[in-house]
Amino acid sequence: AGVFELQIHSFGPGPGPGAPRSPCSARLPCRLFFRVCLKPGLSEEAAESPCALGAALSARGPVYTEQPGAPAPDLPLPDGLLQVPFRDAWPGTFSFIIETWREELGDQIGGPAWSLLARVAGRRRLAAGGPWARDIQRAGAWELRFSYRARCEPPAVGTACTRLCRPRSAPSRCGPGLRPCAPLEDECEAPLVCRAGCSPEHGFCEQPGECRCLEGWTGPLCTVPVSTSSCLSPRGPSSATTGCLVPGPGPCDGNPCANGGSCSETPRSFECTCPRGFYGLRCEVSGVTCADGPCFNGGLCVGGADPDSAYICHCPPGFQGSNCEKRVDRCSLQPCRNGGLCLDLGHALRCRCRAGFAGPRCEHDLDDCAGRACANGGTCVEGGGAHRCSCALGFGGRDCRERADPCAARPCAHGGRCYAHFSGLVCACAPGYMGARCEFPVHPDGASALPAAPPGLRPGDPQRYL
């Protein structure tokens, strides 16, 4: 669980000719508000689907009245952040739509009137817990500047907010099978919280909120004993529909035991037999002490002298891992800005900068956007080389002169038609096919080849599986 936060910095006329008329006037004062809609994934169809990750509406901004004869300035904005809480994992890749709405406060009969001034959309990658990301988007002659981030709500941590952390119960170490919770080293990973009501005897979970059944049990909460009389296979995940055991992976498949541990199946789950020096449910906890010299590459070992006291290796620059055994690819952190080439020289990092940039990390832009033109509502962005344009939706190329055709790759299957709608590509399927990409045949009896229709949808409804 966590919160996506959006901070609007400015909304006003973009650079270049054709400045928009102010949306407010002395006769018709108005104020702005914003709506954000989030959808998971980077797929084009995200724009057609509901705001599956969530949506939020800002407060109303201050009332604004245009000064006669003055050009439209940046318009006064609402206070505060737009916050979109998400209950499940943060997907890492997401699509957004930000709408700017105008509330007219003139002598409207029946209260204020609202109209949509601008809509921008985009697809981004974002790790939870990271810094604020800045963005500029154009919508016609308007320009929206904003920042966004995703942060986890305690006790969740990690780039997807899926790991749970709790304060340590003992000062020196975490419980069996539980690791320290980086970056909060004074906390420990918490046991997973399974779906509410999941049987503690017959169910388990590997992700929060799920309930997976042990052998011999079925049902959404693993409370229904399986009848094995009509079943062929002696083991496997239970089928809730038949009450039967169907073939499937055993608990030891893929060997869940770490560090060379051997796995054996038990009536309820599995058991790891760990090699000397390791213990825990999956042999992931080391019983080694600092006396055994476990830290490689000059790492400094800190910890107690007895096997029950965990040790920690403090690694020198350039190394990582619980035993400092991994060399850090420091270039993987992409320290060189603006497309600079990263060179890891061992003792130091070097950035080889592209034309137009300088500085130890290529952070200094030697070239501003003066006199540079980006076509079709594109914005010239400082820091992208000699001249980089951030293009409006639907345009691409160095100067945004090329129309980006999302249909060029022919994404609609079986003769379906692809349309370049402003919100993303849209497929209209040929008769006999359905799905967001026309990938599913519709059987003559009206049923589709889909495994199952989502709740509330008939299988015969086309293009709704988004």
């Epitope: 129309r403 055709d405 249909c407 349309y419 370049a420 919100s423 086309p462 293009q463």
Partner: antibody, heavy 118, light 109 residues
Framework: QEQLVESGGGLVQPEGSLTLTCTAS?????????MCWVRQAPGKGPEWIAC???????TDYASWAKGRFTVSKASSTTVTLQMTSLAVADTATYFC???????????WGPGTLVTVSS | QVLTQTPSPVSAAVGGTVTISCQST????????LSWYQQKPGQPPKVLIY???NLEIGVPSRFKGSGSGTQFTLTISGAQCDDAATYYC??????????FGGGTEVVVK
């Protein structure tokens, strides 16, 4: 600014022929759209005639328009509608319109008037 | 595919609510590929709503579309004098077929 402009309308005799042209500006047919013709008789509602899908050049017609009307792409910015065996009932304003998704016409031309009269 | 609009004409006072219905003889594509247009004399139709309920950019929020399958409604809440016009529904059907409704004239008094 994306725009459509129709041309080629005018007075034509019954049983005569006429070709209308739709010219796009601000965009081209290199992207995938349905470029369509819709007509509206005086005092009546709009009536769909035909479309050409710019993605692959395939065409679709209203059942009543098949045979007498032909839609084609003349260039990357022009679409034409050829009309034959015109009758007085074909008198209408003919609009060029674009569907760029979800089956609606988000961009229209101002229309060109075709009068069929002897 | 025939779209039938009711009623016509319809009259409303300024600030009042106007409701126009549109019924199709068969389900539109995707159950929601239906749009609404406003037309004033001498002008082409202007789209208000697409995909049954999506407001086109620049259209005041007093216009609202709803419905799915074969039955759709356009509602104008707090009608203004400028809303006096003829309104048309238009559907898109499987097989790449388009159809328009017969229109509903709205008078605002």
């Amino acid at each position: 600014q994306e725009q459509l402009v129709e041309s080629g309308g005018g007075l034509v005799q019954p049983e005569g022929s006429l070709t209308l042209t739709c010219t796009a500006s601000g965009f081209s047919f290199s992207s995938s759209y349905d470029m369509c013709w819709v007509r509206q008789a005086p005092g009546k509602g709009p009536e769909w005639i035909a479309c050409i899908y710019t993605g692959d050049g395939s065409t679709d017609y209203a059942s009543w328009a098949k045979g007498r009307f032909t839609v084609s792409k003349a260039s990357s910015t022009t679409v034409t509608l050829q009309m034959t065996s015109l009758a007085v009932a074909d008198t209408a304003t003919y609009f060029c319109a674009r569907n760029s998704g979800y089956g609606y016409f988000g961009l229209w031309g101002p229309g060109t008037l075709v009068t069929v009269s002897s | 595919q025939v779209l039938t609009q009711t009623p016509s004409p319809v009259s409303a006072a300024v600030g009042g609510t106007v409701t126009i219905s549109c019924q199709s003889t068969e389900s539109v594509y995707g159950s929601d590929w239906l749009s609404w247009y406003q037309q004033k004399p001498g002008q082409p139709p202007k789209v208000l709503i697409y995909q049954a309920s999506n407001l086109e950019i620049g259209v005041p929020s007093r216009f609202k579309g709803s419905g799915s399958g074969t039955q759709f409604t356009l509602t104008i809440s707090g009608a203004q004098c400028d809303d006096a016009a003829t309104y048309y529904c238009q559907g898109y059907y499987s097989g790449y077929i388009y159809a328009f409704g017969g229109g509903t004239e709205v008078v605002v008094k």
